[in-house]
């Protein structure tokens, strides 16, 4: 038999790590093997998550905590608690529904995730371009025009306009 | 080293009563880890005492033959964990072990103590 | 509660040989069922859990299979060191659900 201490509803006694077993006269039964409770009180265990595939496991599971995945090497995770994995590109690129293309001119990408991002306008801020941008990197704005020496010029070529970035369905 | 370790066995009177205990180390018992206690009389077979809930919860598990007279408690802060044996018999006589029940092992015992005898006689 | 049915008792074997011991629940404990393996004054060793996921360390001609109330553990190729008495036991908590089998003793032939 099972002894438990509290005189209110046998199943608010059930902790973490069980589940009120209904079938078995509302006992505070151990979640089974691959399955687990992180409150008390719980009528069932929730399955454990499995890593499979492009995901591996980070924490694994636990009577009390679901496993915790991230994203093999060449993947990145998306979503709340990495509920997906979508594929690395190189920096200067941004994944595509063809695949990873390069960014386009006017515009840069310094991580393997994510779309690629027009470059600073440096002018919209009464400043010059002192390095120009790359598909890799942004521009680095310097002083503006006005406080470089006679003569000293510095053209910010436009944004291009462009369509977002695509993420794979 | 993970290991368990028993102790307090030894001869009793019948209807004595005796407190064995069994100190777990390199593990935390844990809602995830049941300290359980087994006995096996001489030249018998195994028979299942009872387990407690690992965590901080004093929910315990017993067989029904114990009746009451056997009752396991746990020490977290030692890491402890007790059998209260009373009104002991010579059929009590056996040799008492202490096991770990783990969920990643199905709640299997993954771990077992050397055990401890007790003996029961006038 | 829930009984623990162990067949055959005892039997002899030989090296080499192949060993089927069952195990019967007197009502369904699922896939909740443990095989140990103990040698006279050892503590048992868990061979088998979850019916058949076998434990770490174990060799494998030790195998499980069964669910609900029939079960069995299978030695392949018996070995000289698995000369022992072998245990089920059931993992299903609660309601005396721990019970271990009555034991088989695997003796040379």
């Known amino acids: 038999f099972e002894r438990t201490r509290s005189l209110q509803d046998p199943c608010s006694n059930c902790p973490a790590g069980t589940f009120c077993d209904n079938n078995r006269n509302q006992i505070c039964s151990p979640c089974p093997p691959n399955s687990f409770s992180s409150a008390g009180g719980q009528r069932t265990c929730d399955i454990c998550r499995q890593c499979k595939g492009v995901f591996r496991t980070r924490k694994e599971c636990s009577s009390t905590s679901n496993a915790e995945c991230d994203c093999t090497p060449g993947f990145h995770c998306l979503g709340a608690g990495c509920s997906m994995c979508e594929q690395d590109c190189k920096q200067g690129q941004e994944l595509t529904k063809k695949g990873c293309k390069d960014c386009c001119f006017g515009t840069f990408n310094d991580q393997k995730r994510g779309i690629c991002r027009p470059w600073t306008n440096c002018s919209l801020d009464g400043k010059s371009v002192l390095v120009n941008g790359t598909k890799e990197r942004d521009v680095v704005c310097g002083p503006s025009p006005a406080d470089l020496s006679p003569g000293a010029s510095s053209v910010t070529p436009p944004a291009p306009a462009r369509e977002p970035g695509h993420s794979p369905q | 080293e993970v290991q368990l370790v028993e102790s307090g066995g030894g001869l009793v009177q019948p209807g004595g009563s005796l407190r064995l205990s069994c100190a777990a180390s390199?593990?935390?018992?844990?809602?995830?880890?049941?300290p359980c206690w087994v006995r096996q009389a001489p030249g018998k077979g195994l028979e299942w005492i009872g387990c407690?809930?690992?965590?901080?919860?004093?929910?315990?598990y017993d067989a029904n033959w114990t009746k009451g007279r056997f009752t396991i408690s746990r020490d977290n802060s030692k890491n402890t964990v007790y059998l209260q044996m009373n009104s002991l018999r010579a059929e009590d006589t056996a040799v008492y072990y202490c096991?770990?029940?783990?969920?990643?092992?199905?709640?299997?015992?993954?771990?077992w103590g050397q055990g401890t005898l007790v003996t029961v006689s006038s | 509660d829930i009984q623990m049915t162990q067949s055959p008792s005892s039997l002899s074997a030989s090296v080499g040989d192949r060993v089927t011991i069952t195990c019967q629940a007197s009502?369904?404990?699922?896939?909740?069922l443990a095989w140990y393996q103990q040698k006279p004054g050892k503590a048992p060793k868990l061979l088998i859990y979850?019916?058949?996921t076998l434990a770490s360390g174990v060799p494998s001609r030790f195998s499980g299979s069964g669910s609900g109330t029939d079960f069995t553990l299978t030695i392949s190729s018996l070995q000289p060191e698995d000369f022992a008495t072998y245990y089920c036991?059931?993992?299903?908590?609660?309601?005396?659900?721990?019970?271990f089998g009555t034991g088989t003793k695997v003796t040379v032939l």
């Open positions: 407690i809930y690992g965590g901080s919860s004093d929910i315990t």
């Open positions: 390199g593990f935390s018992f844990s809602a995830n880890y049941y």
């Open positions: 979850s019916a058949s």
């Open positions: 096991a770990r029940s783990a969920w990643y092992s199905g709640w299997g015992g993954d771990l």
């Open positions: 009502q369904s404990i699922s896939n909740r």
């Open positions: 036991q059931s993992t299903y908590y609660g309601n005396d659900g721990n019970a």
